[in-house]
């Protein structure tokens, strides 16, 4: 990366990463309180960062109580994929499953969890573990939302006007300014589900010399600042 060579370049960056874990196994306390009967269902919306590894869990039922374990995977624009394990015959079966990055964590008779290696945007979707017992089924479903960190740039494009861009984030980032100026924000939607947010602000008041662009995103926050100088803007980019 190029080093800053004038005052219009990136001056400071503060990061606050919101997601550290790629395991989608919820804190047990949250989900067990109302989940002591068969035929119970728990659904969770869960954001996961792109390029991490994700692990999704079934309900906590011992193998000795089970007949069949099935993972049902519904991804956008694809037929439903199922991965099933039948305990009696100790066999696994897959239907319409083409993504080799989505696999059992280990042998299903040892661990019923599902793993996604190197999460991609295409892994957005619904994942459900169905545990079949002699007395009914237990379900645990995940609405998986893949998060993509936007690339953030801040530059001055004309006299006392600054442009802050959060490029190709998922979901869309939110941009705010300190101090507030006369701002216009535009969003551009890409075919892969990412969004570019561009905020252009003008400060008429001449006693404002430094402005800060704050980008908020589920993957973390970033603050950039520049000095407003009457020169053409150089440009700086940074990842969250």
């Amino acid at each position: 990366a190029a080093q800053p060579n004038n005052s219009l370049m990136l001056q400071t960056s503060k990061e606050n990463h919101a997601l550290a874990s790629s395991s989608l196994c919820m804190d047990e306390k949250q989900i067990t309180q109302n989940y002591s009967k068969v035929l119970a269902e728990v659904n969770t919306s869960w954001p996961v960062k792109m390029a991490t590894n994700a692990v999704l869990c079934c309900p906590p039922i011992a193998l000795r109580n089970l007949i069949i374990i099935t993972w049902e995977i519904i991804l956008r624009g694809q037929p439903s994929c199922t991965k099933a394990y039948k305990k009696e015959t100790n066999e696994t079966k897959e239907t319409n499953c083409t993504d080799e990055r989505i696999t059992w964590v280990s042998r299903p008779d040892q661990n019923s969890d599902l793993q996604i290696r190197t999460v991609a945007i295409t892994h957005d979707g619904y994942y459900r573990c169905i545990m079949v017992t002699p007395d009914g089924n237990f379900h645990r479903g995940y609405h998986l939302q893949v998060l993509v960190t936007p690339e953030v740039t801040l530059f001055q494009n004309r006299n006392r006007t600054a442009v802050c861009k959060a490029v190709a984030g998922k979901p869309a980032a939110h941009i705010s300014w300190i101090p507030e100026g006369d701002c216009a924000t535009k969003q551009e939607y890409w075919s892969n589900g990412t969004v570019t947010v561009k905020s252009t602000c003008h400060w008429e008041v001449h006693n404002v010399s430094t402005v800060t662009c704050h980008v908020s995103h589920l993957t973390g926050n970033k603050s950039l600042y520049i000095e407003l100088l009457p020169v053409p803007g150089a440009k700086k980019s940074a990842k969250l």
Epitope: K29, T32, K37, I61, R64, N65, D113, P134, D135, F138
Partner: antibody
Framework: QVQLVQSGAEVKKPGASVKVSCKAS????????MHWVRQAPGQGLEWMGY????????NYNEKFKGRVTMTRDTSTSTVYMELSSLRSEDTAVYYC????????????WGQGTLVTVSS | DIVLTQSPASLAVSPGQRATITCRAS??????????MHWYQQKPGQPPKLLIY???NLESGVPARFSGSGSGTDFTLTINPVEANDTANYYC????????FGQGTKVEIK
């Protein structure tokens, strides 16, 4: 409501066998795994093994393998635990306990059967 | 096999005070986001009674004075405040394919 009723106390001689029964009611008998646990006088709980009435699967604590046999009779909703080659240290209260699916916890227990092994 | 070690072996507590029992497993009993550790209470002449399941979940009908915590290898059962009828033996239990109990903790009320 769920009930597990065990057979009465037994007195056996060393070397003999004992068969304790546990009759289940109030639920679908074949749907839940049944465990057996014993407790010697003044001692703690010791897991012996389980039987799954759905498919007749069994799994025994290594300590009792070769001496313990767990069976079930679906017509009477009863599970049995037979312990052979009895010795004095087998004197204990024997419990059956039903395993609930979620969390594999034991929510229901029989009242216990005292087996005394004495010459 | 996983060995569970409870401490203390016995405990005398005054009514209204807090009683804390710990259970340490020889290896982790947590998997897939769950800790397969349960706590039982046993009074003389009675079968054990389930208090806490999956480390921290209160069984239906059990007073909220009982609580459980922990993950991995270290777990705690807390009774707060203790009442006179809490005199009993308390056992931790791990439920995997092979099951084990702690050796028990005798709680007496002063």
């Amino acid at each position: 409501q769920v009930q597990l009723v065990q057979s009465g106390a037994e007195v056996k001689k060393p070397g003999a066998s004992v068969k304790v029964s546990c009759k289940a009611s109030g639920y679908t008998f074949t749907s839940y795994v049944m465990h057996w646990v014993r407790q010697a006088p003044g001692q703690g709980l010791e897991w012996m093994g389980y039987i799954n009435p759905y498919n007749d699967d069994t799994n025994y604590n290594e300590k009792f393998k070769g001496r313990v046999t767990m069976t079930r009779d679906t017509s009477t909703s009863t599970v049995y635990m037979e312990l052979s080659s009895l010795r004095s240290e087998d004197t204990a209260v024997y419990y059956c306990a039903r395993e609930d699916y979620y969390g594999s916890r034991w929510g229901y227990w029989g009242q216990g059967t005292l087996v005394t092994v004495s010459s | 096999d996983i060995v569970l070690t409870q401490s203390p072996a016995s405990l005398a507590v005054s009514p209204g005070q807090r009683a804390t029992i710990t259970c340490r497993a020889s290896k982790s009993v947590s998997t897939s986001g769950y800790s397969y550790m349960h706590w039982y209470q046993q009074k003389p002449g009675q079968p054990p009674k389930l208090l806490i399941y999956l480390a921290s979940n209160l069984e239906s009908g059990v007073p909220a004075r009982f609580s459980g915590s922990g993950s991995g290898t270290d777990f705690t059962l807390t009774i707060n405040p203790v009442e006179a009828n809490d005199t009993a033996n308390y056992y931790c239990q791990h439920s995997s394919e092979l099951l084990t109990f702690g050796q028990g903790t005798k709680v007496e009320i002063k």
